[in-house]
Structures are given as C-alpha cells and as structure tokens.
Interface confidence: low
C-alpha cells in the first residue's frame, strides 16, 4: 500500500500555503483527486509529488494515491483544507445527474473542518427541502440525498454557519432521471370497433411512461392523424392522451387505426380495426354440425356463435319437439362474451332422456331483426330384440322385432341345445338378414326393423337367436322350441336407465 | 349542416384582452376539437389553439402565454381570450371545427377584431 | 414569415394547368399530410384538399393534390375564371404540435 507524506489523514492550511504532497509506494504511484488550479504533479523515482506554492478553497479536496500495479488495488488517502474564512465551501460540480433510487452526492466540499456542526442543505432561495428527504453531510463528500426520487429535481445550495451568518454555496442543480423501464404503455380503447354509417365514434389512444419524454400518436391506414394531445400526470407517470371523435362516421372512416408510442428505449404499438356498417347485422353460426346424434344417457353441449351489431336486444334457447313441450332450464343455458361483438351461447344438455330428443332453437333479436339456428338431436339406441312364433301363409316363421337407433342389423343364429346365447361352438347355422323389414323410422325415434325366418319343422333340441347390433351396442332374443310349444328367451331383462 | 359564429368587440385597446366567442349550431359542441385561427396581413394565416368540449386545450407555443381558450358545452359555445393585446394582434379571426387530419372543414365568417387606441 | 413555402402569385389562362407548390420541412410536410385551402376576398377559407390528394364533397376533381417528401403541390387544371382566390396549404407540425400555413398564393385568371 503507497504511503503519503505528511502521515496525517487530515491537513488543514490557509490560503496562499505551500502544499506538498508526497506519495512512496513500491512502484509507480498515481494521484488522484479533484481537478483543480495551482497543484503541480511531479515523480521522483518511486514517489510523486503533488505541490501548490499557492493553495485556495479550490484545492480542498480529498487526494488519493494509488499503486497502479499492485493487485491487491491498494491505496492511501488525505483530505486538504484550504480555510478561507470567505469560502467555506468548494463546490466541484454544478450538476449532478443520478437515476431514481440512487444515492446523490452533491460535492460541497467544507473549507474548514471547524464549520461541520453549522452546515445544512437548502432549495435555492433559501426554500427548505421537500417533505421526505433523506440526506447526510459528509465534510469531505459533502452532502447526500439517499434515495433520490425525481420530485427531488432541484436546484440545491449548502449553507454553513460562520460567525453568526449563514454563507451558501453556489447552487447545484439535481437532475433525478426515471428509470425507463422500456418503451411506453399504451393503450387502444376499443380493440375492435363497428358503427352503421351516420352514427358516431370515439377512439382513444393513450400512452403513458415515468418519463415526459415520448411520443405518441395514432394512424390511420398509416396515415397519421393530426390530433391534438391532452397531457396529464398521476399515479407517477406520464400520460399522452389522442382521442378521435368522429360524429358521423362514413365508409372512409373504416379500416385499420394504430397507436404508436416511442422513447429511447424504442417503440410500442397496438391496432384495432374499424368496421362501418351500411345497416345492424346479426349472423348465427356453430362449429358443430346442425344434426347431432347422441347415445341415450350421455350429455351434449350445443354451441351457437353470434356476430352482433348492435348488441342482443334478446335470446333463448327454445325446445321444438316433437316429444314433450318442455323447455330447456335457463340454468343450463351458458353465455359468454369472447369480445364486444362476437358472443358465444352454450346449451347444456346433461345425461338425455328419450324424450329430449327433438328440435333445439336458439333465437337471438337486435335492431336488424329476428334470427335463429335450430339443432336437430337424434338418439343412439341399442338395439332391443324380441322373437315370436307365428304362422304366415302357412309357413312357421320366426318373426323377430329389432327397435334401436341407428337401424339394428340382424342377425339368425341356428345352435345346437337349449342356451340363452349361441355360443361359436354350439352354432349350426347362420343367417344375416341384409334387408330387415323396416317397420317404423320416424325423426328422433327408434327405427324398428322386423326380420323373419321361414323354419319348416322347429328342431327341438336347438336354439334360435336373434341377434341385432348398431353403432351402440347390440341385444338378442333365444328361441327355444319345445314339446309343449315355442318358449322364447330375452338373454337379460332389458334395463333402461338413462 | 354545422355553422359557427363568431362575436365580441371589434377594436381593443392595446395592453387589454381580447375576448370572443365562438357559437356552434347544427351540432354539438360535445365532440370534436374546436379552434381559432386568425389571418393577419402581416403573419397569414395562424393557428391559435384548439379546445375540446372537456376543457382540454393546445396553445400554439408563440401565444401560449398570452392565450386562454374555454368552452360553455351548456351553450354550445367555445372562446377565445388574448391577452396583452398589440397593434400585432389585430387580424381577422375565425372559429373552426377541427379535420381529423389536422384540417379545418368548417369555419366561420370571421371577426375582424382592431388593436388600436 | 410563414412555416410553409408558396409562391405568392400563380397565373394562367383559362382552360389551362396551372400547379402551385408548398414547401416546408420534415417535422410538418415530411411526416404529416397537406391540406388545401381556396379563400376569397372577404370570406372564410374553405377546404380544398385534405390529407394530400381527397377532395370534400363538392369539389370539382378538376383541383387535385399531391406529396413528395417535404413539399406538396395543387394542380388545377381547365381553368375557369372563378378559380381565381387566394391558396393555401397547410400541415401538422410535430414540432409545434399543432397545423402551420403557408403564406398563400394568389392565382389570377388572365
């Protein structure tokens, strides 16, 4: 570590003194302080000397020697006073330019260290400090204000007490700079905007930054627009504020509107679009398709997506039949806003019974008129079979009765013994009926099918299935000839619980 | 179709304010930005300053000082005021309803208004 | 002396084209558009052309606008004696926040 001579950390002369500094380290030293008049710098060998053969309150400073080469950076310091009881203060800048948050340091440096307990930081003009400030006094540094916010932006004198009187620095202005965290915010109200010709419209593009220091403006089409800038400042910010009015708006008007802001750190901007209407709209439509089939028990949601202008006078979901007159519970019925004009209505039908199926009509009503986009529900059932003996034009005939949604398939199965249910070892024979005989097959009901099978003579230790199946499932009947007569068997009660 | 109309005095001693008012029918006043403007021999055509019917103003930097521009929304009315008035000043001035563009697409027939003792 | 540039006169016969030009800078003309403006002695100015080339509705098309960088022109063609009026341009100033004229041109029908 370099060493100064005199050994002292404080010297104190007069005016008009010799001053000599000498500064010995192992290798080249340096001084280092503030710049001012008189000092003469020279080297001898290992040590530098730093001389005045005049020194003024301009020399007061803190004078530091460094070793350049040392790693360690080692250095040694000693504050010089020139007291000059006409210049209790040194002030080494007249500006001093921090960012929000840092700590100033405004450099009134004390020219007698006996004035330390007199000293305090004034506003020019004698104004005190605002509300809040935080400061310190160092005699050497001079004055800090920790913290600094941009309110703080002044210009500042420092005040010593000798004999009596108060003597102030010249003043130092502060500039506190915001930290700009980047472009500007900006705001474009609306984001999307449509009017019939003749009425009238608003858009307002607004910007706002911790710094005054940006620029804002709104384009159309990429023409700028010449709007005149209402300025305002809360919440800590800036603001810029364009708002274009438009009484009557006419097809022109439409198209593309941005609001571009930009400051130092670059360039935000936001668009939405504008429509002109000759006359209200109001479309319906849905991803889904109109016809929907679903099994029996399970739930479907029914979405109807609506474009409006202007907005719904009205809506409902409404029930058509055929089956029941009831009406959708309000409660199920869901709608959501995706943005000013573009709504999205959700009919919730959860675990459906037979007697929902039918018509679902979702109505909606604005000044252009009535609308409406209608559902049409269809139920998937398994099939349910059932199998007679009978007689036709004299023939015994199996006549076996298939009722499901989509229409069942059937088909016979001929197996050896007695059984519920053929199984692929006991099958003798068997028949796919391609053509069942469609007895019923209105909208949103079951389609019932009849298939018959023409048995000259009923083999008594055999059994015969009829079997159907659809997209759903499938079902069957065993018949079971015996002695006494025809004895029929369903594999399982059928059970219905939707 | 919108007018304007302006009034006040026609000659104002110089050092004292000129007032006038700008009366807007065929519309409201409650939308758009409103102006004056004055043509003088001397400067041409000048933009004073625009208002809007919340009380927002822009001052052309040369008069900023000296200009005060209000609006009455109740009487459909904006006005100018201009203070510290010098033989400078005198010219024709015109109220107008502010273009979108910067433009003026209506005006008035205009005042002229003399400074002169 | 005013922001934008005109020539005060302009001349011509009628049936003729006769173009008047504008100059001005990049804070008005360079990044804003140019409005015209037709004035007769004794009455309001009245809007000729906005946003560089759009007519209002009644003006004849026979008035037409143009920009280039920092200077716009009105072209007037077949030229009628009730053209003759004084000729504004005028812009926004990004410096001034605020529109800026030009000193007029007088067109006179011979």
């Known amino acids: 570590i370099p060493v100064i001579e005199p050994s002292v950390p404080e010297l104190v002369v007069k005016p008009g003194a010799t001053v000599t500094l000498r500064c010995v380290g192992n290798g080249s030293v340096e001084w280092d302080g503030p710049p001012s008049p008189h000092w003469t710098l020279y080297s001898d060998g290992s040590s530098s000397i730093l001389s005045t053969n005049n020194a003024t309150f301009q020399n007061t400073g803190t004078y530091r020697c460094t070793e350049p080469g040392d790693p360690l950076g080692g250095s040694a310091a000693i504050h010089l006073y020139v007291k000059d009881p006409a210049r209790p203060w040194n002030v080494l800048a007249q500006e001093v330019v921090v960012f929000e948050d840092q700590d100033a340091l405004l450099p009134c440096l004390l020219t007698d260290p006996v004035l330390e307990a007199g000293v305090s930081l004034v506003r020019v003009r004698g104004r005190p400090l605002m509300r809040h400030t935080n400061y310190s006094f160092s005699p050497w540094h001079g004055f800090t204000i920790h913290r600094a916010k941009f309110i703080q932006s002044q210009d500042y004198q420092c005040s010593a007490l000798m004999g009596g009187r108060k003597v102030m620095s010249i003043s130092i202005r502060l500039k506190v700079q915001k930290v700009i965290p980047g472009p500007p915010a900006l705001t474009l109200v609306p984001a999307e905007l449509v009017r019939i010709r003749g009425e009238a419209a608003q858009i307002v593009c607004s910007a706002s930054s911790v710094d005054v220091n940006f620029d804002v403006f709104l384009q159309h089409n990429n023409t700028k627009l010449a709007i005149p800038q209402q300025s305002d400042f809360h919440n800590n910010r800036y603001q810029k504020v364009l708002t274009l009015n438009l009484d009557q708006v006419d097809f022109q008007h439409a198209g593309n509107y941005s609001c571009v802001a930009s400051n130092v750190q670059g360039k935000h901007s936001t668009s939405m679009f504008f429509r002109v209407v000759e006359s209200a709209y109001l479309n319906l439509s849905s991803e889904q398709n109109l016809i929907q089939e679903v099994t029996v028990g399970e739930g479907l949601n029914l979405k109807v997506m609506v474009e409006a202008y202007p907005g719904l006078q009205g809506f409902n979901w409404t029930y058509l039949g055929p089956f029941s007159d009831h009406q959708p519970e309000p409660k199920l019925a869901n709608a959501t806003t995706k943005d000013t004009y573009r709504h999205t209505f959700t009919l919730s039908l959860p675990r459906l019974k037979p007697s929902e199926a039918g018509r679902y009509s979702f109505l909606a009503r604005n000044p252009g008129g009535w609308r409406a986009l209608t559902f049409e529900l269809t139920l998937r059932y398994p099939p349910e079979v059932s199998v007679i003996w009978t007689f036709i034009n004299g023939s015994g005939t199996l006549l076996c009765a298939a009722s499901g949604y989509p229409q069942p398939n059937v088909t016979w199965l001929q197996c050896s013994g007695h059984t519920d249910r053929c199984d692929e070892a006991q099958v003798l024979q068997v028949w796919d009926d391609p053509y069942p005989e469609v007895l019923s097959q209105e909208p949103f009901h079951k389609v019932t099918v009849q298939s018959l099978l023409t048995v000259e003579t009923l083999e008594h230790n055999q059994t015969y299935e009829c079997r159907a199946h659809n997209s759903v499932g499938s079902g069957s009947w065993a018949f079971i000839p015996i002695s006494a007569g025809a004895h029929t068997h369903p594999p399982d009660e059928f059970l219905f619980t939707p | 179709q919108v007018q304007l109309q302006e009034s006040g005095p026609g000659l104002v001693k110089p050092s004292e304010t000129l007032s006038l008012t700008c009366t807007v029918s065929?519309?409201?006043?409650?939308?758009?930005?409103w102006s004056w403007i004055r043509q003088s021999p001397g400067k041409g055509l000048e933009w004073i300053g625009y208002i809007y019917y919340s009380g927002s103003t822009n001052y052309n930097p040369s008069l900023k000082s000296r200009v005060t521009i209000s609006v009455d929304t109740s009487k459909n009315q904006f006005s100018l005021k201009l203070s510290s008035v010098t033989a400078a000043d005198t010219a024709v001035y015109f109220c107008?309803?502010?273009?979108?563009?910067?433009?003026?697409?209506?005006w008035g027939q205009g005042t002229l208004v003399t400074v002169s003792s | 002396q005013s922001v934008l540039t005109q020539p005060p006169s302009a001349s011509g016969t009628p049936g003729q084209r006769v173009t008047i030009s504008c100059s001005g800078s990049?804070?008005?003309?360079?990044?804003?558009?140019v409005n015209w403006y037709q004035q007769f002695p004794g009455t309001a100015p009245k809007l000729l052309i906005y946003?560089?080339?759009q007519r209002p509705s009644g003006v004849p098309d026979r008035f037409s606008g143009s920009k280039s960088g920092t200077s716009a022109s009105l072209a007037i063609s077949g030229l009628q004696s009730e053209d003759e009026a004084d000729y504004y341009c005028?812009?926004?100033?990004?410096?001034?926040?605020?529109?800026?004229f030009g000193g007029g041109t007088k067109l006179t029908v011979l």
């Open positions: 107008a309803r502010a273009l979108l563009t910067g433009g003026f697409a209506y």
């Open positions: 990049s804070s008005n003309i360079g990044s804003n558009t």
């Open positions: 946003s560089n080339n």
């Open positions: 005028a812009a926004w100033d990004d410096s001034l926040n605020g529109p800026v």
């Open positions: 065929g519309g409201s006043i409650s939308s758009y930005y």
